[in-house]
Amino acid sequence: YDFTNCDFEKIKAAYLSTISKDLITYMSGTKSTEFNNTVSCSNRPHCLTEIQSLTFNPTAGCASLAKEMFAMKTKAALAIWCPGYSETQINATQAMKKRRKRKVTTNKCLEQVSQLQGLWRRFNRPLLKQQ
């Protein structure tokens, strides 16, 4: 999906008012310095592409993030503020439904959510120069 035509300010507002705290709660008990940010993004569409990938695509050692509360809210926000997103995701979801995973918090998942927090922070500050 091409995130170029999303309403970025509405997505930012959704993140600040309904998503950010759930990421913090997920990471509770973890030091903010524990993980290095290795995933970056250069602009808002790129950030949303990376956020979608990290949130919804199972990875080795962390298969279950898509069933977390913050993931559900991200899915809902993208569907509302990105034209055509819901249509493009329907087919993808049918395939995903067949392999729903039980929610398990692993160190790899914590690292992945830490990366997500960084991506969201970058999304919210689009005018900053890339480090």
Epitope: T18, E68, K73, A76, I80, S86, Q89, I90
Partner: antibody, heavy 117, light 109 residues
Framework: QVQLVESGGGLVQPGGSLRLSCAAS????????MSWVRQAPGKGLEWVSG???????YYAGSVKGRFTISRDNSKNTLYLQMNSLRAEDTAVYYC???????????WGQGTLVTVSS | DIELTQPPSVSVAPGQTARISCGGD??????VYWYQQKPGQAPVLVIY???KRPSGIPERFSGSNSGNTATLTISGTQAEDEADYYC???????????FGGGTKLTVLG
């Protein structure tokens, strides 16, 4: 303007079935997570069920296995199929638009379901 | 699912400040929402994301959330504020939304 209009409520005997409908207008229905919330007479609000744009569903424990939520995005309509109804299912049923999955920003006017012999 | 506990009733004199509490385990780690419901009407969202007001909701409505308690505050309460108020949050395991039992706000006089 944004509107949700429920229909299909009425009197039904215990063990019976009923299908509620909710017609949505004024917004892009196919993009939103939609839900049903009920309120027994003189009691509080109870979330019943919700459904994503892609058909992914969630249910309260009290109705799981008896109620089925569905939607027809081409008709901008939300449904709730209620089977094996019990007296404790008697309530006003509200159709609701759930903003960002975790709260309700738009409510219908409600439709009364009475389960009694 | 988590349980949200509200006082059944709160009374306040016109012009005074009304505070309605909502208790729940580690509630401060989740977002809380507040709804106003008047007799025979559907609920109306008055606070979202702990402390934000939807457009059209008067400034006298405010919210806070920390620790195990969220609070809805109505400053300079008016007669029209008499209603039932429900807090709402969500369960991080089931992903279901959860309502408090509701609080009947009575404006005296």
């Amino acid at each position: 303007q944004v509107q949700l209009v429920e229909s299909g409520g009425g009197l039904v005997q215990p063990g019976g079935s009923l299908r509620l409908s909710c017609a949505a207008s004024g917004f892009t229905f196919s993009s939103y997570y939609m839900s049903w919330v009920r309120q027994a007479p003189g009691k509080g609000l109870e979330w019943v069920s919700g459904i994503f744009f892609d058909g992914e569903t969630y249910y309260a424990g009290s109705v799981k296995g008896r109620f089925t939520i569905s939607r027809d995005n081409s008709k901008n309509t939300l449904y709730l199929q209620m089977n094996s109804l019990r007296a404790e299912d008697t309530a006003v049923y509200y159709c609701a638009r759930q903003q960002y999955f975790d709260h309700i920003d738009i409510w219908g006017q409600g439709t009364l379901v009475t389960v009694s012999s | 699912d988590i349980e949200l506990t509200q006082p059944p009733s709160v009374s306040v004199a016109p012009g005074q400040t009304a505070r309605i509490s909502c208790g729940g385990d580690s509630l401060g780690g989740k977002y809380v929402y507040w709804y106003q419901q008047k007799p025979g009407q559907a609920p109306v969202l008055v606070i979202y994301g702990d402390s934000k007001r939807p457009s059209g909701i008067p400034e006298r409505f405010s919210g806070s959330n920390s620790g195990n308690t969220a609070t809805l505050t109505i400053s300079g309460t008016q007669a029209e504020d008499e209603a039932d108020y429900y807090c709402q949050s969500y369960d991080l395991q089931s992903l279901n939304i959860v309502f408090g039992g509701g609080t009947k706000l009575t404006v005296l006089g």
